[in-house]
């Protein structure tokens, strides 16, 4: 099985024990590590952070001791903006320039492939996204002709039904991608006005969301029905939680909220907590399991957080094995307890290690 793990370059800027550099990563933990994100500048792939080149080097030296490790560079992301991607993909010359710029950039920095993180193609971009993937793959095939190992091509896709329908021609893009990471998280957010888990495995009777689509099981099944081969589908598991501020004394699933949860001490983003911040939060909190959804949430005061723990990730891995998927994807290594100092287990990357162990279990 694949264990595809994202690392985010901006995690270096978190304060104190939250600061994560690629040399803190475990070279034997994941089969693939994806560095997020690269930029596109004037139609050419490029660095984003001032010290990306140094960080690329840190990441890719992990392969010196584990030659089986593959590294990819993810291009795009939330801050890149869908419109910018759209302009490049829809213009033949821009698309060509971008595609031609990718292999030398990846080879220069020692990456084994490219991950496309266009979040998200619009309805009018669907065909252009397919073309971009098809042409990028063709370039990788030609570029490998002189006996080089062919560069890998993957994409991170939304797990939301509405986005899947409008953005992706799943059957066509699956032909050209080496694997597809389905982002089976962020199903539920503060916009709903109530508490709810952002990454439930199943719908469950407790699901207060107005549809039956906002869960991992539906998203995976839908992708498979649309023609994604199970052998290419990698299922996303978050090492972060989504938090809410309760608006009343109600604390269950579907309780009213006044907005996102308070920012974490390190991640500093309202409504989001890294797993290592959740471990802190759990001291003195009340933990509940949403039985049907097979995921936990915790409450403390007026704060509510839905997250994944070692038990829930094992359930998710069992599920992906039952469906014969290619493996698991983790967002993100730097949100796990990468130092092993927060979650009291004396173990670095406890969630990702639990995923790895479950994937290896017979």
């Amino acid at each position: 099985y694949k264990l595809v793990c994202y690392y985010t370059s901006w995690s270096q800027y978190r304060e104190g024990d939250g600061s994560c550099f690629p040399d803190a990563l475990d070279r034997f933990l994941c089969t693939h590590i994806i560095y997020s994100f690269a930029n596109i500048s004037n139609d050419h792939i490029d660095t984003w952070e001032w010290n990306d080149v140094t960080l690329y080097g840190m990441l890719n030296t992990l392969k010196n001791r584990n030659p089986n490790l593959k590294t990819l560079l993810s291009v795009g992301g939330w801050n890149f903006g869908s419109q910018r991607f759209s302009k490049i993909a829809s213009n033949t010359q821009s698309r060509r320039t971008f595609i031609k710029s990718v292999p030398p950039f990846l080879r220069t920095h020692g990456f084994d492939g490219l991950d496309l993180a266009w979040l998200y193609p619009g309805r009018r971009d669907k065909q252009h996204f397919t073309t971009l993937i098809k042409e990028m793959k063709a370039e990788f095939i030609k570029e490998a002709q002189p006996g080089k190992k062919q560069l890998l091509l993957s994409a991170a896709l939304s797990a939301g039904k509405v986005t899947i329908d409008s953005s992706y021609d799943i059957a066509k893009i699956s032909q050209h991608l080496d694997f597809i990471s389905i982002m089976t998280y962020d199903f539920h957010g503060a916009w709903r006005g109530t508490t709810g888990h952002h990454s439930p495995l199943f719908r469950g009777q407790e699901d207060a969301s107005p549809d039956r689509f906002s869960n991992t099981d539906y998203a995976v099944g839908y992708m498979l029905r649309l023609g994604a081969p199970a052998s290419k589908l990698v299922m996303g598991i978050p090492t972060f939680g989504r938090s809410f501020t309760l608006a009343s004394s109600e604390t269950g699933v579907g309780a009213p909220i006044s907005g996102p949860g308070i920012p974490g001490r390190f991640t500093k983003e309202a409504g989001t907590l890294a797993y290592y911040e959740i471990c802190d939060f759990l001291r003195g909190a009340t933990v509940h399991r949403i039985l049907g959804q097979q995921v936990p949430y915790a409450t403390k005061g007026n704060q509510w957080v839905g997250y994944d723990d070692q038990e829930s990730v094992k359930s998710k891995v069992q599920y992906l094995k039952d469906r014969q998927l290619a493996g698991a994807m983790v967002w993100a290594l730097d949100l796990d307890d990468f130092q092993g100092s927060f979650c009291g287990q004396d173990l670095r990357f406890p969630l990702t290690n639990a995923i790895k162990d479950a994937l290896a279990a017979t």
């Epitope: 500048s41 004037n42 490029d46 320039t97």
Partner: antibody, heavy 118, light 110 residues
Framework: QSVEESGGGLVKPEGSLTLTCTAS?????????MCWVRQAPGKGLEWIGC???????TYYASWVNGRFTISKASSTTVTLQMTSLTAADTATYFC????????????WGPGTLVTVSS | ALVMTQTPASVSAAVAGTVTIKCQAS??????LAWYQQKPGQPPKLLIY???ILASGVSSRLKGSRSGTEYTLTISDLECADAATYYC????????????FGGGTEVVVK
């Protein structure tokens, strides 16, 4: 691994000239760039243009204005056709090879001198 | 068209000293910048590509860096062999930008 220019010499104003760049010792690579750069006596380097070996795409500096044409003559040779030459085109013309713009030109020929004079 | 403005035109420094050469791009070119060294009667030699990566066989006394659209080449612990003209070059080969060179900086080592 080397590149070498040939075809330089004296040419009259408004005349034409074709320079040839020959690459040798390189293992096969799908995509690389063969480019032309010139340097007037005592002056700096000036980029003329490039051809992408992979698909034959050509790129030119805006000042070229169609007077110069870069083309692939064979798997190892590239030509620079120059027309409507003036005294301002007098320079040493270098051929340079690089795997991409990102990686710069890592192989240069010794240069060939073109003199435009009546 | 893209213009690469290189400063200073000439710089003089003593052996074991340090020189800094700057190159200002008129538009953003990201990390697509290379530095070359040229000695009289010779073709240019690639020193640095991708803003900061040393080409094969180039001394670690050379360092490339960037701040926005300003690029810097620093040569420390100067040697007599460093006396040459240095050029920056944009690494975009498309016709919108062209692989424009800076005007060059002559380094004199005393």
């Amino acid at each position: 691994q080397s590149v070498e220019e040939s075809g330089g010499g004296l040419v009259k104003p408004e005349g034409s000239l074709t320079l040839t760049c020959t690459a040798s010792g390189f293992s096969f690579s799908y995509r690389y760039y063969m480019c032309w750069v010139r340097q007037a006596p005592g002056k700096g380097l000036e980029w003329i243009g490039c051809i992408d070996n992979g698909d034959g795409d050509t790129y030119y500096a805006s000042w070229v204005n169609g007077r110069f044409t870069i083309s692939k003559a064979s798997s190892t040779t590239v030509t620079l056709q120059m027309t409507s030459l003036t005294a301002a085109d007098t320079a040493t013309y270098f051929c340079a090879r690089g795997s991409s713009g990102y990686n710069g030109f890592n192989f240069w020929g010794p240069g060939t001198l073109v003199t435009v004079s009546s | 068209a893209l213009v690469m403005t290189q400063t200073p035109a000439s710089v003089s420094a003593a052996v074991a000293g340090t020189v800094t050469i700057k190159c200002q791009a008129s538009q953003s070119i990201g990390s697509y910048l290379a530095w070359y060294q040229q000695k009289p009667g010779q073709p240019p030699k690639l020193l640095i590509y991708a803003t900061s990566i040393l080409a094969s066989g180039v001394s670690s006394r050379l360092k490339g860096s960037r701040s926005g659209t300003e690029y810097t080449l620093t040569i420390s612990d100067l040697e007599c062999a460093d006396a040459a003209t240095y050029y920056c070059q944009c690494g975009y080969y498309d016709s919108n930008y062209g692989g424009a060179f800076g005007g060059g900086t002559e380094v004199v080592v005393k």
